[in-house]
Interface confidence: low
C-alpha cells in the first residue's frame, strides 16, 4: 500500500511507545558513541514530527522516506566528525547511498566500556525514580553494543527486563529474585544478538538466495506438515522482515513481523499443531514464541524421496523449468524428513544435489549420471556426526572450562594471527556447545551443535573482517557460508606462523585477580594460555597443561597470602622462569 506519509503510517501501526523505542534502537545502532541524552533528544524530535504527520499527512516533509527523515536527523549531530571520523562523510551523500554508508560503518566491536552491573538497591532506586528513562537506557546500551540486534526482539527483552524489576524490587530478597533473571536475560540476549548477526551476514555477504535456502530448511524442519507453498510464503515474508531489520528499517521490520505472526496464527491449522499456546500470547511474546517453537511431528506416511528426485524420468525437465523452485522442493522434502540434521548439513546436501544435476542434465544419459547422487550424501552426513561424537566425549571427559582450553589451543594453532581477545571470546563460546548440546539425545545433537557453531564462527568472521589479519580466516569466512565450520575444522597448525616474541609483561599478574569473579578469572587464565601458544605454537598438550596447572596453583597461593602483591611479584617471576624452562622459551 502506498501511504501519503510513511512516518505517520508506522506511528499509527506501531503506537507511540513502540515507535519511540524502535527509533531509539535505530539511532543507537547507527551512532554507537553518542551519549544517551543526545539520542533521547533526537528521538523526541522525530516523535513530535511524526505526530504532526499523523494529524495532517500533507504537512511539510511528511511525504519524505524514513531513511531521509532519520538520516537528516542523524546528520544534525554536532560532533559527528570528531566522534566518528569518516562516517561524517555519509552525510554528504543522497539516499539510498547515505543509509548504505551508515550501515557500512556499524561496528561489531565498538570501543565502549564494559557494562558493570550496579548494586541491586541502586538499580531498584533508579527503576523506581524514573522507570521510563531506566528502560530507555537499557535499549540504548544494548543497541549500541549490538548494532544488528533484532529490534522487535529487543522490545521483548525490554519487556522482560521491566517485569523483572517490577517484581523483584518489591521482593524480600531483591538480589536472589533479580540476579538470576538478569543473568538469564544477559545470556539469552548475547545468544539472540549472535543468531541475528548470522542472519544479517547471510543476507549481506551471500545474498537473499542464501538466506531463503536457510529459511526453507529451518521452517520445513519446524513445520513438516505444512505444504511446500505454505512454507514458501512464510520464507518470502520472513526474508522481507530480516532484510528490513538488517538494513536498519526497524519500523517496517517490526510492523511486518507483527503481520507475519498474525498470519501464522490465523493459519496455524495448515502450518503446525504446536502453535496454539504461542498464539494466545500478547504480540511480543507471541512473535518470540513462534520463533522458538518446537518442531511439529513429521507426517507418518511420507514417501521415499528417491521417487521424485532420483527415479523420476522428469528430474531434469523439472529442474530446467524452474531450478530454484525444484531445488527448494528438494530442500523442503529433505528437511521435513530430517529434524535430526543441522540446517547447514541440509544446505550442503542441497548444494551437492544441485551440482550433480547441473553436471548430469547436460550428460548423454542424465539418469545414469545422477542415479547414485544419494550415495554422495553419506560422507557429508557422517562428518558432522563423527565430529560431534568426538567433541562431546572430550567435553564429558574434561568439563566446560578445560574443554574451552582445548579449543583455545586448537584454534590458536590454526589461526595464531587473530587477536587474543577474539580467540578467547570465540573459543569460550565454541566450548559452550558442550553444555548446550551434548546433553541432548543423538537425534537433537547435530542441529543443536552445528547450527550453534555456525553462529559462533560468524562472530569470528565479523570480528576478523573489521581488522583482517589471517588469509585462512578470510578464506573460510568468505568461500561458502555452509562450509565455514568444515573449513575451520580442516585447518591444521599454521606452519608459516613466526612465534611471538616473549614479553614478561604479558605474564605479570597482580592481586586484583583475586577479587575477580570465577568467570573473569578464567578469562585471565585463558588469555595467558593463548599468549603461551602464540609464543610456543609447537608446545605439546602436556607442556601446556603443566604450565597452566602451575599458573592456577600460583594464583591460588598468592590469593591466600597476607601480602598478595609481593607474592604475585616474587612468585610470578619464578613462574615465568619455570614456564620458560618447561617450554624451552
Amino acid at each position: 500500500d502506498a501511504h501519503k506519509s510513511e512516518v505517520a503510517h508506522r506511528f499509527k501501526d506501531l503506537g507511540e511507545e513502540n515507535f519511540k523505542a524502535l527509533v531509539l534502537i535505530a539511532f543507537a545502532q547507527y551512532l554507537q558513541q553518542c551519549p544517551f541524552e543526545d539520542h533521547v533528544k533526537l528521538v523526541n524530535e522525530v516523535t513530535e514530527f511524526a505526530k504532526t504527520c499523523v494529524a495532517d499527512e500533507s504537512a511539510e516533509n511528511c511525504d519524505k522516506s524514513l531513511h531521509t527523515l532519520f538520516g537528516d536527523k542523524l546528520c544534525t549531530v554536532a560532533t559527528l566528525r570528531e566522534t566518528y571520523g569518516e562516517m561524517a562523510d555519509c552525510c554528504a551523500k543522497q539516499e539510498p547511498e547515505r543509509n548504505e554508508c551508515f550501515l557500512q560503518h556499524k561496528d561489531d566491536n565498538p570501543n565502549l566500556p564494559r557494562l558493570v552491573r550496579p548494586e541491586v538497591d541502586v538499580m531498584c532506586t533508579a527503576f523506581h525514580d524514573n522507570e521510563e528513562t531506566f528502560l530507555k537506557k537499557y535499549l540504548y546500551e544494548i543497541a549500541r553494543r549490538h548494532p544488528y540486534f533484532y529490534a522487535p526482539e529487543l522490545l521483548f527483552f525490554a519487556k522482560r527486563y521491566k517485569a523483572a524489576f517490577t517484581e523483584c524490587c518489591q521482593a524480600a530478597d531483591k538480589a536472589a529474585c533479580l540476579l538470576p533473571k538478569l543473568d538469564e536475560l544477559r545470556d539469552e540476549g548475547k545468544a539472540s544478538s549472535a543468531k541475528q548477526r548470522l542472519k544479517c551476514a547471510s543476507l549481506q555477504k551471500f545474498g537473499e538466495r542464501a538466506f531463503k535456502a536457510w529459511a526453507v530448511a529451518r521452517l520445513s524442519q519446524r513445520f513438516p506438515k505444512a505444504e511446500f507453498a505454505e512454507v514458501s510464503k512464510l520464507v518470502t515474508d520472513l526474508t522481507k522482515v530480516h532484510t528490513e531489520c538488517c538494513h536498519g528499517d526497524l519500523l517496517e521490520c517490526a510492523d511486518d513481523r507483527a503481520d507475519l505472526a498474525k498470519y501464522i496464527c490465523e493459519n496455524q491449522d495448515s502450518i503446525s499443531s504446536k502453535l496454539k499456546e504461542c498464539c494466545e500470547k500478547p504480540l511480543l511474546e507471541k512473535s518470540h514464541c513462534i520463533a522458538e517453537v518446537e518442531n511439529d511431528e513429521m507426517p507418518a506416511d511420507l514417501p521415499s524421496l528417491a521417487a521424485d528426485f532420483v527415479e523420476s524420468k522428469d528430474v531434469c525437465k523439472n529442474y530446467a523449468e524452474a531450478k530454484d523452485v525444484f531445488l527448494g522442493m528438494f530442500l523442503y522434502e529433505y528437511a521435513r524428513r530430517h529434524p535430526d540434521y543441522s540446517v547447514v548439513l541440509l544446505l550442503r546436501l542441497a548444494k551437492t544435489y544441485e551440482t550433480t544435476l547441473e553436471k548430469c542434465c547436460a550428460a548423454a544419459d542424465p539418469h545414469e549420471c545422477y542415479a547414485k547422487v544419494f550415495d554422495e550424501f553419506k560422507p557429508l552426513v557422517e562428518e558432522p556426526q563423527n565430529l560431534i561424537k568426538q567433541n562431546c566425549e572430550l567435553f564429558e571427559q574434561l568439563g566446560e572450562y578445560k574443554f574451552q582450553n582445548a579449543l583455545l589451543v586448537r584454534y590458536t594453532k590454526k589461526v595464531p594471527q587473530v587477536s587474543t581477545p577474539t580467540l578467547v571470546e570465540v573459543s569460550r563460546n565454541l566450548g559452550k556447545v558442550g553444555s548446550k548440546c551434548c546433553k541432548h539425545p543423538e537425534a537433537k545433537r547435530m542441529p543443536c551443535a552445528e547450527d550453534y557453531l555456525s553462529v559462533v564462527l560468524n562472530q569470528l568472521c565479523v570480528l576478523h573482517e573489521k581488522t583482517p589479519v589471517s588469509d585462512r580466516v578470510t578464506k573460510c569466512c568468505t568461500e561458502s557460508l555452509v562450509n565455514r565450520r568444515p573449513c575451520f575444522s580442516a585447518l591444521e597448525v599454521d606452519e608459516t606462523y613466526v612465534p611471538k616474541e616473549f614479553n614478561a609483561e604479558t605474564f605479570t599478574f597482580h592481586a586484583d585477580i583475586c577479587t575477580l569473579s570465577e568467570k573473569e578469572r578464567q578469562i585471565k587464565k585463558q588469555t595467558a594460555l593463548v599468549e603461551l601458544v602464540k609464543h610456543k605454537p609447537k608446545a605439546t598438550k602436556e607442556q601446556l597443561k603443566a604450565v597452566m596447572d602451575d599458573f592456577a596453583a600460583f594464583v591460588e597461593k598468592c590469593c591466600k597470602a597476607d601480602d598478595k602483591e609481593t607474592c604475585f611479584a616474587e612468585e610470578g617471576k619464578k613462574l615465568v622462569a619455570a614456564s620458560q624452562a618447561a617450554l624451552g622459551l
Partner: nanobody
Framework: EVQLVESGGGLVQPGGSLRLSCAAS????????MSWFRQAPGKEREFVSA????????RYAESVKGRFTISRDNSKNTLYLQMNSLRAEDTAVYYC????????GGQGTTVTVSS
C-alpha cells in the same frame, strides 16, 4: 532423553529438616553445573542454590544462606539439598535444573512447612 526426578519433599514442622534428592539421567551429569529453584503457590520460580560440575563452587540465595546446603554425588548422578531450620516461607515446590536456567527442570517435589 534428559530426565531429572526430584524426591524427598513432605510435610515438616517449622525448625525441622528435610533432604531433597534429584536423580539425573540421559546426560553426563558430572560435566554440568546444577541448581535448585523453588516456586511457591501464586509466585514465580525463584533461585535457591547452585553448584558447579565438580562440587567446589556453591551459591545460595540470601534467604536460605546458613540453613540450606547443596551437594552432589557424581558417581550416583544425584544432586542434594539439605534443608535445616525450615520456615513457613520455605513452603514451595522445589525443582532441580541443569545450569542456572529457571525454565528447565523436573516435575518437582513439594515441601510444606506448617505446624
Amino acid at each position: 532423553e534428559v530426565q531429572l526426578v526430584e524426591s524427598g519433599g513432605g510435610l515438616v514442622q517449622p525448625g525441622g529438616s528435610l533432604r531433597l534428592s534429584c536423580a539425573a539421567s540421559g546426560f553426563t551429569f558430572g560435566s554440568f553445573g546444577m541448581s535448585w529453584f523453588r516456586q511457591a503457590p501464586g509466585k514465580e520460580r525463584e533461585f535457591v542454590s547452585a553448584i558447579d560440575s565438580g562440587g567446589a563452587d556453591t551459591r545460595y540465595a540470601e534467604s536460605v544462606k546458613g540453613r540450606f546446603t547443596i551437594s552432589r554425588d557424581n558417581s550416583k548422578n544425584t544432586l542434594y539439598l539439605q534443608m535445616n531450620s525450615l520456615r513457613a516461607e520455605d513452603t514451595a515446590v522445589y525443582y532441580c535444573t541443569i545450569g542456572r536456567s529457571a525454565s528447565r527442570g523436573g516435575q518437582g517435589t513439594t515441601v510444606t512447612v506448617s505446624s
